[in-house]
């Protein structure tokens, strides 16, 4: 059984982890980013099912599909440094899912956009923070 | 040497269908999007679409929408503009061009020589 | 659809000339920092042929003779010295938001 002190890491995990994918999401899902349009040209694989941690396989999976994007989302006054965020992403998800069993993702047929892919995982993590608070 | 080279001259009659081709060669097609630009004769330069070879993503711009169809072949690192049917007021030459936008950047780096299409009866 | 108004539209001009075309948009086409201008060569029945870039960045390969300035809604194409292979049609960019426009472009004859 999974003791408090345990319970509480994995939940400052999600809050992480959280926090990343909303300051992904807010730094791109700007009306005035002049390369939104573009950036929604890519497509992501969605989780069929996205309920527990060993579901984080599925985002795992698409990582690096989601730097390639955040690469065009650079500025001056903006710096998102996709491989260190994409790095982070990583270690957290790697911690959370574990490693002890190996989970097979099933995606659901229809790909997604970023920003709806963005909004999937932050659904989950804030779904999952909130069966443990 | 990265390039891309388009199909050659098309002569078509109004209503008639139509698909010119792109082909990109020397760098990693599917890593780059591809934009079509139109130029009307003796006029300047309009720009009428995006696709992500990678996806198939589309993105056109609103005159554009309905009028034309872009569509990739990635196995053949081709991209396609087509036409249902065909009007005199298409008569253009139209290129391909191979968007820049990692970093700061947005802009279309490499063209093709382009394509003539004329649409007379 | 933000437009582009390029001055002078034509003009004619000597080798050795220092050359200035303007373009100025209908509302800032700056972000978070970064001005989304750019500007092409287009020479007849050629392709057009990337210049500058982000307003001031040079392409590679491009003779440093030419320069681009400016941010929010007016840039600048400076070519320092004007040579015979530089007579052509220039045409200013922007891809700040879509519908991405040209100017009406700017044909450099010989005088």
């Known amino acids: 059984a999974p003791t408090s002190s345990s319970t509480k890491k994995t939940q400052l995990q999600l809050e992480h982890l959280l926090l990343d994918l909303q300051m992904i999401l807010n730094g791109i899902n700007n009306y005035k980013n002049p390369k939104l349009t573009r950036m929604l040209t890519f497509k992501f694989y969605m989780p069929k099912k996205a309920t527990e941690l060993k579901h984080l396989q599925c985002l795992e999976e698409e990582l690096k599909p989601l730097e390639e994007v955040l690469n065009l989302a650079q500025s001056k006054n903006f710096h998102l440094r996709p491989r260190d965020l994409i790095s982070n992403i990583n270690v957290i998800v790697l911690e959370l899912k574990g490693s002890e069993t190996t989970f097979m993702c099933e995606y659901a047929d229809e790909t997604a956009t970023i920003v709806e892919f963005l909004n999937r995982w932050i659904t989950f993590s804030q779904s999952i923070i909130s069966t443990l608070t | 040497e990265v390039q891309l080279v388009q199909s050659g001259a098309e002569v078509k009659k109004p209503g008639e269908s139509l698909k010119i081709s792109c082909k990109g060669s020397?760098?990693?097609?599917?890593?780059?999007?591809i934009e079509w630009v139109r130029q009307m004769p003796g006029k300047g330069l309009e720009w009428m679409g995006v696709?992500?070879?990678?996806?198939?993503?589309?993105n056109y711009n609103e005159k554009f929408k309905g009028q034309v169809t872009i569509s990739a072949d990635k196995s053949i690192s081709t991209a396609y503009l087509q036409w249902s049917s065909l009007k005199a007021s298409d008569t253009a030459m139209y290129y391909c061009a191979r968007w820049r936008g990692e970093g700061y950047y947005a802009y279309f780096d490499v063209w093709g020589q382009g394509t003539t299409v004329t649409v007379s009866s | 659809a933000i437009r582009l108004t390029q001055s002078p539209s034509s003009f004619s001009a000597s080798t050795g000339d220092r050359v200035t075309i303007t373009c100025k948009a209908s509302?800032?086409?700056?972000?978070?920092?970064?001005?989304?201008m750019n500007w092409y060569q287009q020479k007849p029945g050629k392709a057009p042929k990337l210049l500058i870039y982000t307003a001031s960045n040079l392409e590679s390969g491009v003779p440093s003779r030419f320069s681009g300035s400016g941010s929010g809604t007016d840039f600048t194409l400076t070519i320092s010295s004007l040579q015979s292979e530089d007579f052509a049609t220039y045409y200013c960019?922007?891809?700040?938001?879509?519908?991405?426009?040209f100017g009406g472009g700017t044909k450099v004859e010989i005088k």
């Open positions: 020397g760098y990693a097609f599917t890593n780059y999007l």
């Open positions: 509302q800032s086409v700056d972000y978070q920092g970064d001005s989304y």
């Open positions: 696709i992500n070879p990678g996806s198939g993503g589309t």
């Open positions: 960019q922007q891809s700040n938001e879509d519908p991405y426009t």
